[in-house]
Amino acid sequence: ASVIYVYVQDYRSPFIASVSDQHGVVYITENKNKTVVIPCLGSISNLNVSLCARYPEKRFVPDGNRISWDSKKGFTIPSYMISYAGMVFCEAKINDESYQSIMYIVVVVGYRIYDVVLSPSHGIELSVGEKLVLNCTARTELNVGIDFNWEYPSSKHQHKKLVNRDLKTQSGSEMKKFLSTLTIDGVTRSDQGLYTCAASSGLMTKKNSTFVRVHEKPFVAFGSGMESLVEATVGERVRIPAKYLGYPPPEIKWYKNGIPLESNHTIKAGHVLTIMEVSERDTGNYTVILTNPISKEKQSHVVSLVVYVP
């Protein structure tokens, strides 16, 4: 498939432009060693052509070395020289008249992705019917375009929504941020599994994954290894952890001989019941009650504390 060009010398229209060209696009990389060709072809071979870049306005003329113009090729220039510009065009002077080519928009392309971060990054638990929202943020060098793709258990999901957008970064920042948000409105058990977000510039791809656990319904239970008897000597620090399984995390309340325990300087009643310096009077039965905040289901467990006097 060969192409034949017929050049008609026209001093009133020295630059060749196809009918469809209102403006062109020139892609460049900020690379000291790379040259770029602005394809302002000429109908006349021995024109004095310069390249105008703006803004600010700068003019580049052929130097017989790395800057040149060829009627069959266009204007060649090191790409870093015009990387600041928003647009460029070629200009020819014929008998004190100026003729301009079409405008070419300058697009500087980068490719490097620094990292891809998922949020939440871990420990994601939901129950059937709840909404899953995962944010994937890619940090890149400037002048990068990003393509996102997600891989997850039910990729053909009817109720999923994907939104990609660029994030504003502080002026003077050396970095650009892109965000892709995956939303699944009502999760099912089949949505449980590994979720991977990949960000790609074309030359570099980075990905990150997180596991999403989907429970049939809210629940609460004690985990294995929950002690029933704890023995200590006077003066020791005692720690009794409330080992549980549950979604969402339960409310935890501790009682001693049926009386609610409140945290103070000698006792901390949280996920772990901590008695700073145990004394004889701390002997007794401690009850921990777990309450699921959604279903209000309760589970209780009694731990007997025996304190020995040496």
Epitope: T29, I146, G202, M204
Partner: antibody, heavy 117, light 112 residues
Framework: EVQLVESGGDLVKPGGSLKLSCTAS????????MSWVRQTPDKRLEWVAS????????YYADSVEGRFTISRENAKNTLYLQMNSLKSEDTALYYC??????????WGQGTSLTVSS | DIVITQNELSNPVTFGESVSISCRSS???????????LNWFLQRPGQSPQLLIY???TRASGVSDRFSGSGSGTDFTLEISRVKAEDVGVYYC?????????FGSGTKLEIK
Amino acid sequence: EVQLVESGGDLVKPGGSLKLSCTASGFSFSIYGMSWVRQTPDKRLEWVASISVGGSYTYYADSVEGRFTISRENAKNTLYLQMNSLKSEDTALYYCARELDGNYDYWGQGTSLTVSS
Amino acid sequence: DIVITQNELSNPVTFGESVSISCRSSKSLLYKDGKTYLNWFLQRPGQSPQLLIYLMSTRASGVSDRFSGSGSGTDFTLEISRVKAEDVGVYYCQQLVEYPFTFGSGTKLEIK
């Protein structure tokens, strides 16, 4: 097991066209960048083209810009290279390679293109 | 474009010995993020290239610890200790600091 299988290589006359395919299996194709790299008869490796995960961004070596087009069909786990206006210097073994972090971590076995009259 | 230079042949080596393969770049491959973007590949006879080392010194998954990479911004070395028959092939280095990514011409591991 990760597998990349190239096909479509042939003997073509200068100026002719050809389309190469690369079928991927054993991994999630849609979350990896993909590239074509060629090995010339003198055994030199030359990067040819690359494409982003969704196909929105493509890059080409200067020697093939405007003549070759890289594309992908994620639903079919397939990467393509459409080659037009072929020249004798395009004669090579064409590999498709999986890319992550810019690194080509898996390569196919290659498909051979000969451009000769 | 960045030019990567390699010797055509390594120093002749006997199985069980160590050998160094060198690679030189026309420009520093140390990027502003502090990482050096140089990769090493091995192409065994009749096979496709296999990634050995990335970021100058990090071994790719499944690669033997007999392979180690080192270097400065422009001069790099791949060290192979206790050379085995399976190490025979052509070793290529590649830069990833600047697009287009370029490869060296390859160094053939020569066995005595």
